[in-house]
């Protein structure tokens, strides 16, 4: 990996915090859309978990070179309903394929400014970033 | 909040890296066990995704005060098989409830040592940490 310049002003202990805190979730680059393809809407009998799932999904790369981690992946559901355990292909309308979201801690590289406002290396700013982790087969909500 | 010491030696730009890079996955505190409770092995019709799933799970806290994020959650499957979409309670042996793992980027706070070996604040060391995100209903692998 190439090294990032650090967060520090050039004299003494830094007055800047290493991490600037913000807990406002940052939206992902694209809305975590559903991505239904009847051709891929099937549960495989081998391969990785996301293809053997009865709520199969694919991963979409979200890369930001000024963020740690630079690469995040968003799950995209391949079917609106769950696939039948029996056939692995026909959909069962009694089950929905729903995205599981998570607010992940990420760090953004931001310029740090010294006391005179001059640019002094980089600071890391902590943010919560919403990612979709997987698609899960759930029973539909029954409203009370 | 009071500031915690940064990663920087006290003179000039740091010779220490802000982030020490290491991609050796760190195992979670406990093995991501299955946690079968017949009483909770059911798919609810309301509540959060992890209780409505036909592969329901609970979350277990993993806290480390010298890690960012300090709190991580490991999924623990509540059923060995998937729950029937029809009843929400009986298990269907044609489907397995499997843990979905992810190597998450975390940062550990480590002492930094100046040129003379004296302690100068903290550095952050990047590691990959294996977490179980969810339980997914999958078709069992068919061995070729």
């Amino acid at each position: 990996y190439s090294h990032w310049p650090s967060c520090c002003p050039s004299k003494g202990y830094p007055s800047e915090e290493l991490l600037r805190w913000s807990t406002v979730p940052v939206p992902p680059l694209k809305p975590a859309s559903l991505d239904f393809h009847s051709v891929s809407c099937r549960a495989s009998e081998d391969g990785p978990l996301n293809s053997r799932a009865i709520s199969p999904w694919r991963y979409e790369l979200d890369r930001d070179l000024n963020r740690l981690p630079q690469d995040l992946y968003h799950a995209r559901c391949l079917c609106p309903h769950c696939v039948s355990l029996q056939t692995g292909s026909h959909m069962d309308p009694r089950g929905n394929s729903e995205l599981l979201y998570h607010n992940q801690t990420v760090f953004y590289r931001r310029p740090c400014h010294g006391k005179k406002g001059n640019h002094k290396g980089y600071c890391l700013e902590r943010r919560l970033y919403r990612v979709s982790l997987a698609c899960v087969c759930v029973r539909p909500r029954v409203m009370g | 909040y009071s500031h915690w010491p940064s990663c920087c030696p006290s003179k000039g730009y740091p010779s220490e890296e802000l982030l020490r890079w290491s991609t050796v996955p760190v195992p979670p505190l406990k093995p991501a066990s299955l946690d079968f409770h017949s009483v909770s092995c059911r798919a609810s019709e309301d509540g959060p995704l992890n209780s409505r799933a036909i592969s329901p799970w609970r979350y277990e806290l993993d806290r480390d005060l010298n890690r960012l994020p300090q709190d991580l959650y490991h999924a623990r499957c509540l059923c060995p098989h998937c729950v029937s979409l029809q009843t929400g309670s009986h298990m269907d042996p044609r489907g397995n409830s499997e843990l979905l793992y992810h190597n998450q980027t975390v940062f550990y706070r480590r002492p930094c040592h100046g040129k003379k070996g004296n302690h100068k604040g903290y550095c952050l060391e990047r590691r990959l940490y294996r977490v179980s995100l969810a339980c997914v209903c999958v078709r069992p692998r068919v061995m070729g």
Partner: antibody
Framework: QVQLVQSGAEVKKPGASVKVSCKAS????????MNWVRQAPGQGLEWMGL????????SYKQKFQGRVTMTVDKSISTAYMELSRLRSDDTAVYYC??????????????????WGQGTLVTVSS | DIQMTQSPSSLSASVGDRVTITCQAS??????LNWYQQKPGKAPKLLIY???TLHTGVPSRFSGSGSGTDYTFTISSLQPEDIATYYC?????????FGQGTKLEIK
Amino acid sequence: QVQLVQSGAEVKKPGASVKVSCKASGYSFTGYTMNWVRQAPGQGLEWMGLINPDNGGTSYKQKFQGRVTMTVDKSISTAYMELSRLRSDDTAVYYCAREGYYGPSPFHHYAMDYWGQGTLVTVSS
Amino acid sequence: DIQMTQSPSSLSASVGDRVTITCQASQDISNYLNWYQQKPGKAPKLLIYYTSTLHTGVPSRFSGSGSGTDYTFTISSLQPEDIATYYCQQYSKLPYTFGQGTKLEIK
């Protein structure tokens, strides 16, 4: 102001279950972890476990694993602690306690900063 | 689990005295230690977190210090309202553990 109000005293037979409630007010319920601590008559404090009301994530003391279940109802800002297969040595005052987090940021410190008034559970045949 | 050993288990002191309670952890807890006060029939109350930081509204006669495995809680000048049982608690690692308590009485 922050308040934790617990349910009333209970008398239970050995082998039964008890469910204690803890209603929170005066703060964002989902923003703070809730701990459960018990105290047998004339004894010290014993931590049982905690729950994050936001995602239902828990951590239980090994001793209580399989017997304790901590849950929340976010809609009414209430935490619950259910203890099953009760024995006479489970006779105790059960407390809920909010876990505050303090600086220095970003490495927080944790302490039980607000406590419920306690619920006496008596297990007797 | 981390064991916390508090001493003494009880002590008697006069108003105005300096009172010291110690707490020893079975392993290094990196200053991740809290102190609580519990009066008879009441719920515990947080006094000090992270070894030495006073919680909001706690009088300055209370203080804490220590590092590694050994920690100290001090009341610089004992007041009648300080009669209570005091507990240390580590939060270095789950499960959290408490000391067995020190019962403080007035002579």
